[in-house]
């Protein structure tokens, strides 16, 4: 669960009164003020480990739409445009929090859920190359 | 806010009775069952655009600890270990949901917040601006 700051008057997480269900305000506060508006915009295409973005939609989840990256090549793209198979494209994955409607279709009751998403791809040296 | 499935008996999001505050169960369900256990483990070090991971801690947020990637180089690392400045290491960023205690220190009241995090780095061809 969530670690609660130790304030007097706050039951600790071992306490039977510790809240397993909390109130959450859905008016999302967006902290991304000073970020580069371009962000990862066209990196998916310009990367040496380019990726495609696939739309994953689930109306029982918030956010309902998540974009999943899928690397385009097993190798990495060289300056001449050919694939270098001595290098490997791999997905960079991150665990994110989503809200899952529980019970299903219920508008005001959710459960926190962790899911693993691929955000983009990076080019790595393979662990092993040749056999003696 | 969150788009609600149109079920009979569910007020729509224009309705004044639409819930802006919902109940969320904090017993996290983890969906990462069939994912590759290796995940991004040592990619940060083996990448041609390697990155360091910085711990960002905030007790008023859940998750309280978020790891931020910072690219190690402006350029990308070549096979010989030298940096190629004709290429650029760039962070792959993703918007994620977190829960922010509101009011502060309150254990059972939160607000959804979107924050932008850098998950890792990728090597891209630079956008070249030629001078006429």
């Amino acid at each position: 669960g969530i670690a609660i700051p130790r304030n007097s008057g706050c039951p600790n997480s071992e306490d039977k009164n510790f809240p397993r269900t909390v109130m959450v305000n859905l008016n999302i506060h967006n902290r991304n003020t000073s970020t580069n508006p371009k962000r990862s915009s066209d990196y998916y295409n310009r990367s040496t480990s380019p990726w495609n973005l696939h739309r994953n939609e689930d109306p029982e989840r918030y956010p309902s739409v998540i974009w999943e990256a899928k690397c385009r090549h097993l190798g990495c793209v060289k300056a001449d445009g050919n694939v270098d198979y001595h290098m490997n494209s791999v997905p960079i994955q991150q665990e994110i929090l989503v809200l899952r409607r529980e019970p299903r279709h219920c508008p005001n009751s959710f459960r926190l859920e962790k899911i693993l998403v691929s955000v983009g791809c990076t080019c790595v040296t393979p662990i092993v190359h040749h056999v003696a | 806010g969150i788009a609600i499935p149109r079920n009979s008996g569910c007020p729509n999001s224009e309705d004044k009775n639409f819930p802006r505050t919902v109940m969320v169960n904090l017993n996290i369900h983890n969906r990462n069952t069939s994912t590759n256990p290796k995940r991004s483990s040592d990619y940060y070090n083996r990448s041609t655009s390697p990155w360091n991971l910085h711990r960002n801690e905030d007790p008023e947020r859940y998750p309280s600890v978020i790891w931020e990637a910072k690219c190690r180089h402006l350029g990308c690392v070549k096979a010989d270990g030298n940096v190629d400045y004709h290429m650029n290491s760039v962070p792959i960023q993703q918007e994620i949901l977190v829960l922010r205690r509101e009011p502060r220190h309150c254990p059972n009241s939160f607000r959804l917040e979107k924050i932008l995090v850098s998950v890792g780095c990728t090597c891209v061809t630079p956008i070249v601006h030629h001078v006429a």
Epitope: V90, P126, I127 | -
Partner: antibody, heavy 120, light 111 residues
């Protein structure tokens, strides 16, 4: 069902060029790579190259760079391979095949092949 | 290029036999994403290759369960538990983690 249709045979003169076709049906053309593979009589299979129909990205085996050029026509879901400077060494059966991307990167469906004969 | 070596070149069998075909690669076929890209095809005379097994051990749709694949690193095996007449032809292994290459083929024929 997934089908890759290729003409049965082509006869061309030495030194000439030829364009082989591969018409895809039964799936979304732009979601899969198209590969080309050469097979000489009684011999093994040689990979020539691949093209991504979604953006026409091509990747060639070093051996066939300069010999083969891969293109697609999205409107007709057809892939093409142009072979130039033909010699008797180019006489072979040429297969097109499709593959998925990344985790699904293997040729799962193949055309019946075009027999190319280079002869005067 | 990665060299794929198949043994034997020719495999005379009787119907109902269990047979194994070996494929060895000159380089390890494990990708950094954890997958091993070694596949098996069957080519019958006058036809195109048909996918049997992908990524070492996964049977392609419609392939009977008498076909199985195993192995890791550089050594791989295709097993047919009970050979049927429809199984005769040339078997190829291939790898797609490097520039794609194919083995030389193993001809399965009746004794």
């Amino acid at each position: 069902q997934v089908q890759l249709q290729q003409p049965g045979a082509e006869l061309v003169m030495p030194g000439a060029s030829v364009r082989l076709s591969c018409k895809a049906s039964g799936y979304t053309f732009t979601n899969y790579w198209i590969h080309w593979v050469k097979q000489r009589p009684g011999q093994g299979l040689e990979w020539i190259g691949e093209i991504d129909p979604s953006d026409t990205f091509t990747n060639y085996s070093p051996k066939f760079k300069g010999k083969a050029t891969l293109t697609v026509d999205k409107s007709s879901s057809t892939a093409y391979m142009q072979l130039t400077g033909l010699t008797s060494e180019d006489s072979a059966v040429y297969f097109c095949a499709r593959s998925g991307i990344y985790y699904d990167y293997y040729e799962d469906y193949w055309g019946q092949g075009t027999t190319l004969t280079v002869s005067s | 290029d990665v060299v794929m070596t198949q043994t034997p070149l020719s495999l005379p069998v009787s119907l109902g036999d269990q047979v194994s075909i070996s494929c060895r690669s000159s380089q390890i076929l494990l990708h950094s994403n954890g997958n091993t890209y070694l596949h098996w095809y069957l080519q019958k005379p006058g036809q195109s290759p048909k996918l049997l097994i992908y990524k070492v051990s996964n049977r392609f749709s419609g392939v009977p369960d008498r076909f199985s694949g195993s192995g890791s690193g550089t050594d791989f095996t295709l097993k047919i538990s009970r050979v049927e007449a429809d199984d005769l032809g040339v078997y190829f292994c291939s790898q797609s983690v490097h520039v794609p290459t194919f083995g030389g083929g193993t001809k399965l024929e009746i004794k």
